[in-house]
Interface confidence: low
């Protein structure tokens, strides 16, 4: 007869590994007893387990609790251990020895391979801000037995760096997303995707990307100077800007004050009927938490009948 | 487990001014921002504006004139003044949390505030 | 302003049914949207942020897609716990809402 094992029983932390060990004898054989041993190289064997074909099963104290002979029904010829909850200081060599009649003693040898999937965690780099140059926006560490994959799964354009330390029973990943922010960034989910082989599928940890940044600020509504005359009603400024966080705006006038009934409301400068006390430089301040910007315009009233008068002039003159 | 709270009174008169209260149990103002939103009975939501744990405020360019947010570190409370009510004032008033960004994770219970005379 | 255009406005569904509500922006707000389930009488609550994530605590029921300016909040299995007003809302730039979608018990 011979034994059937595996070479190597692959298991996750935590789960029981079944270690098998089944002798295919001629008819008539019997199987006696099987014990069960570790016996990692260099190490003295240590023993597991015994099981009597009229004893039943021994477990030795340093696994008591922890080894049982699979459920039943069971056939005599099988000398199978579970191995419950396996924890990595399980991992290593095991042999089975198998007595039987009238065919003598065997032994056979497997691996125990427990696998540690990781917990990946990711963490954010620094404050991202429109104008950096190559900046980390977020690394990713998984450590587990074996070393895991750590990858990166975006739309964003970047580079990515990975580096590994090795434990004396697992190893570390960590791998970097580098990227140059920009606006358009804003929103964007950047996920680090974490495979093993003690993974049913892969990890995924998303990071949404912020990047603050500030646009340049432009004012709208002098796009026709010569609706800016004495007057006129409803005229307003618009100052144009857009940002993250969302900007405040602040209007002032550089050769003074604001002129009484002038009306600022946020982003938006209400003028009363015009006269000529409305003519001057008029800036809009915008800014949030990441910066600030200014953009300034001349106003200058007109007066028609200043402008009709010279139109009579030229006539008269021709 | 973070909790806000608001109060102040339910009833004011028109053309008064508002106010109200948001006090901050279960962790701090430090990196986050309390906004005000709120809502007219039956209808949506609507964001008032934000105080930022460096101190900053953002407003809704619609309330802007009428609307001041100020905080008191010390108790971690955040107040919200809505001046010149009118009876379109009238609306449950939430105090909400965030991150950096306008998104809200933790809310207040809301409390109603009438504007009748 | 940003305009938020939520559809539909309301719709009556079954326990059990999958529901579909769209949000669009009136300009591309790149991802930064949030969506909220409000039931009568509390506050609202944060189901999905940054268009596809999902708040902590939220079923796996819920979930959000979209990109530019075109995104949609779906419900797997609607459970009777379900049934309330959803709201959209942008935050970029000054933040606003969508006017709402109530989902009623057919």
């Known amino acids: 007869g011979e034994l059937e094992t595996s070479d190597v029983v692959t298991v996750v932390l935590g789960q029981d590994a079944k270690l098998p060990c089944f002798y295919r004898g001629d008819s008539g054989e019997q199987v006696g007893q099987v014990a069960w041993a570790r016996v990692d190289a260099g190490e003295g064997a240590q023993e597991l387990a015994l099981l009597h074909s009229k004893y039943g099963l021994h477990v030795s104290p340093a696994y008591e609790g922890r080894v049982e002979q699979p459920p039943p029904p069971r056939n005599p010829l099988d000398g199978s251990v579970l191995l419950r909850n396996a924890v990595q200081a399980d991992e290593g060599e095991y042999e089975c020895r198998v007595s039987t009649f009238p065919a003598g003693s065997f032994q056979a040898r497997l691996r125990l391979r427990v696998l540690v999937p990781p917990l990946p965690s990711l963490n954010p780099g620094p404050a991202l801000e429109e104008g950096q140059g190559l900046t980390l926006a977020a690394s990713c560490t998984a450590e587990g037995s074996p070393a895991p994959s750590v990858t990166w799964d975006t739309e964003v354009k970047g580079t990515t760096s990975s580096r590994s330390f090795k434990h004396s029973r697992s190893a570390a990943v960590t791998s970097e997303f580098h990227l140059v922010p920009s606006r358009s960034m804003n929103g964007q989910p950047l996920t680090c995707v974490v495979s093993h082989p003690g993974l049913l599928q892969d990890q995924r940890i998303t990071h949404i990307l912020h990047v603050s940044f500030l646009a340049e600020a432009s004012v709208r509504g002098l796009e026709d100077q010569n609706l800016w005359h004495i007057g006129r009603e409803g005229a307003m400024l618009k100052c144009l800007s857009e940002g993250q966080p969302p900007p405040s705006y602040n209007w002032t006038r550089l050769d003074g004050p604001l002129p009484s009934g002038v009306r600022v409301d946020g982003d938006t400068l209400g003028f009363p009927p015009l006269t000529t006390e409305h003519s001057g430089i008029y800036v809009c301040h915008v800014s949030n938490e990441f910066s600030s910007r200014d953009s300034q315009v001349t106003v200058d009233v007109l007066d028609p009948q200043e402008d009709s008068g010279k139109q009579v002039d030229l006539v008269s003159a021709s | 487990q973070v909790q806000l709270q608001e109060s102040g009174p339910g009833l004011v008169k028109p053309s008064e001014t508002l106010s109200l209260t948001c006090t901050v149990s279960?962790?701090?103002?430090?990196?986050?921002?309390v906004h005000w939103v709120r809502q007219p009975p039956g209808k949506g939501l609507e964001w008032i504006g934000v105080?930022?744990?460096?101190?900053?405020?953002n407003y809704n360019p619609s309330l802007k004139s009428r609307v001041t947010i100020s905080r008191d570190t010390s108790k971690n409370q955040v107040s919200l003044k809505l001046s010149s009510v009118t009876a379109a004032d009238t609306a449950v008033y939430y105090c909400?949390?965030?991150?950096?960004?306008?998104?809200?994770?933790?809310w207040g219970q809301g409390t109603l505030v009438t504007v009748s005379s | 302003d940003i305009q938020m255009t939520q559809s539909p406005a309301s719709l009556s569904a079954s326990v059990g049914d999958t529901v579909t509500i769209t949000c669009r922006a009136s300009?591309?707000?790149?991802?930064?949207l949030a969506w909220y389930q409000q039931k009568q009488g509390k506050s609202p609550q944060l189901l999905v942020y940054?268009?596809?994530n999902l708040a902590d605590g939220v079923p796996s029921r819920f979930s959000g897609s979209g990109s530019g300016t075109q995104y949609t909040l779906k419900i797997n299995s609607l459970q009777s716990e379900d049934f309330g007003t959803y709201y959209c809302?942008?935050?970029?730039?000054?933040?606003?809402f969508g006017g709402g979608t109530k989902v009623e018990i057919k």
């Open positions: 909400a949390r965030s991150g950096k960004w306008y998104y809200f994770d933790y």
């Open positions: 105080i930022w744990s460096g101190g900053s405020t």
């Open positions: 279960g962790g701090s103002l430090t990196n986050y921002g």
């Open positions: 940054a268009a596809t």
């Open positions: 809302q942008h935050f970029w730039g000054t933040p606003t």
């Open positions: 300009q591309n707000i790149y991802s930064n």
